[in-house]
């Protein structure tokens, strides 16, 4: 028996369902009574789900997994993982045994989009050209860790005087806070981009300083 899985990682959004695809080619006359199917975590060998002795043995993994019982006889051994969590990320191995056995591993990459950044300025009043200001760009509840970029109003990257911190919450999602310190000109626009490297999802925030009052322009 030959087991086939997708070579590319399966990308799943947090709180959605994911399908880890696995298939085999059944011989003519194959019946489910001959099938032993085991899904397990590749690294720890922890059992996730199994089908043995002609029946589904159920989920051994937080009761969030399921097979596709009607499709098993056609060689579809895929696993459905419900309400994906950050902690589900990793490699899963699909073992299929009929007369002989084969196995293959599939990777699950978990992702969550970052929120539109909120921009804050300190100090935020009585600003004058030559003043040093701190612009903070905050974006929340994303996964994995973000890439953060700053650009000035002409699209040139700002790399000096940038400090970025990322903290995971209890669900493993990251809150990003990036701080840019700049000396003000007569006016200026400063933009922050928070990029999710897995989803290639960009979230932009901008602040334009034109004396008083400050403006926070809409996204372009």
């Amino acid at each position: 028996v030959e087991v086939q899985v997708s070579e590319d990682p399966v990308v799943a959004l947090v709180d959605t369902d994911a399908t880890l695809r696995c298939s085999f080619s059944p011989e003519p006359g194959f019946s489910l009574a001959q099938l032993n199917l085991i899904w397990q975590l590749t690294d720890t060998k922890q059992l996730v789900h199994s089908f043995t002795e002609g029946r589904d043995q159920g989920s051994a993994y937080s009761n969030r997994t399921a097979l596709f019982p009607d499709l098993l006889v056609q060689g579809n051994a895929s696993l459905r993982l419900q309400r994906v969590r950050v902690t589900d990320e990793g490699s899963y191995t699909c073992f299929v045994s009929i007369q002989d056995f084969d196995s293959a591993a599939v990777s699950l990459q978990v992702a969550a989009p970052y929120s539109k950044p909120s921009m804050t300025l300190e100090p935020n009043k009585d600003l004058r050209p030559g003043n040093m200001v701190t612009i903070t760009c905050s974006s929340y509840q994303g996964y994995p860790e973000a890439e953060v970029f700053w650009k000035d109003g002409q699209g040139v990257p700002l790399t000096g005087n940038v400090t970025t911190s990322q903290m995971a919450n209890e669900r493993g999602l990251f809150d990003v806070h990036s701080v840019l310190r700049v000396v003000l000109g007569a006016n200026g626009t400063y933009s922050c981009l928070v990029r999710n490297p897995v989803l290639q999802q960009d979230a932009h925030g901008s602040v334009t300083i034109t004396g008083q009052p400050l403006t926070f322009p809409p996204e372009a």
């Epitope: 970029f149 650009k151 000035d152 109003g153 002409q154 699209g155 040139v156 990257p157 700002l158 000109g185 200026g188 933009s191 981009l193 989803l199 290639q200 999802q201 960009d202 979230a203 932009h204 901008s206 996204e219 372009a220």
Partner: antibody
């Protein structure tokens, strides 16, 4: 008419430096960044870096960092790029180009005619 | 770094014919928020500087004839010239601006 006028061809010796100029006209010079691009037979078009004419902020391609220096003179609407410690591999045409766009997507809508730099002993 | 690969490196067609050239990027250039691809096409005629033809993968720069069409998304892009004219003799470059800027190696268009 929007134009970027570049300085003339340069013949320099290995190890020396060259400074190329790019003068903007027909638009408000400090409203747009100036990018520099190298064109050689070996490497096609290569982005060197960018300078924001209003913010005086520069960003260099890692390959050219430490050897290229971009500056602007706002009073004359001119951008400059100096390239130091030249070798034969720096023989190329160097273009300045105006950065145009919005948000985080920028493209080069106006180009200078190019400055040919030849490095030879 | 994002690598841009253009093909073919050169091609020759007769005036009036349709031509297509390809540009592939090593990672997606699609901004999922704006649904725009950060890809531009430039035309460089012999002895001249490059000229912007297309940006956002498919938006024609003002003044560019409508026989030039950009298409594609993600990692695969195409520039099509529906009815090639003698003045289209040039090298065509694609360029990504998703992460800094990199150009493809160019496609040289020759007229038979």
């Amino acid at each position: 008419e929007v134009q970027l006028q570049q300085s003339g061809p340069e013949l320099v010796r290995p190890g020396e430096s060259v400074k190329i100029s790019c003068k903007g006209s027909g638009y408000t010079f400090t409203d747009y960044a100036i990018h520099w691009v190298k064109q050689s037979h070996a490497k096609s078009l290569e982005w060197i870096g960018v300078i924001s004419t209003y913010y005086d902020n520069t960003y260099y391609n890692q390959k050219f960092k430490g050897r290229a220096t971009m500056t602007v003179d706002k009073s004359s609407s001119t951008a400059y790029m100096e390239l130091a410690r030249l070798t034969s591999e720096d023989s190329a045409i160097y273009y300045c180009a105006r950065g145009y766009g919005s948000s985080f997507n920028w493209y080069f809508d106006v180009w200078g005619a190019g400055t040919t730099v030849t490095v030879s002993s | 770094d994002i690598v841009m690969t253009q093909s073919p490196s050169s091609l020759a067609v007769s005036a009036g014919e349709k031509v297509t050239m390809s540009c592939k990027s090593s990672q997606s250039l699609l901004n999922s928020r704006t649904r725009k691809n950060y890809l531009a096409w430039y035309q460089q005629k012999p002895g001249q500087s490059p000229k912007l033809l297309i940006y956002w993968a498919s938006t024609r720069e003002s003044g560019v004839p409508d026989r030039f069409t950009g298409s594609g998304s993600g990692t695969d892009f195409t520039l099509t010239i529906t009815s090639v004219q003698a003045e289209d003799l040039a090298v065509y470059y694609c360029k990504q601006s998703y992460n800094l800027y990199t150009f493809g190696g160019g496609t040289k268009l020759e007229i038979k």
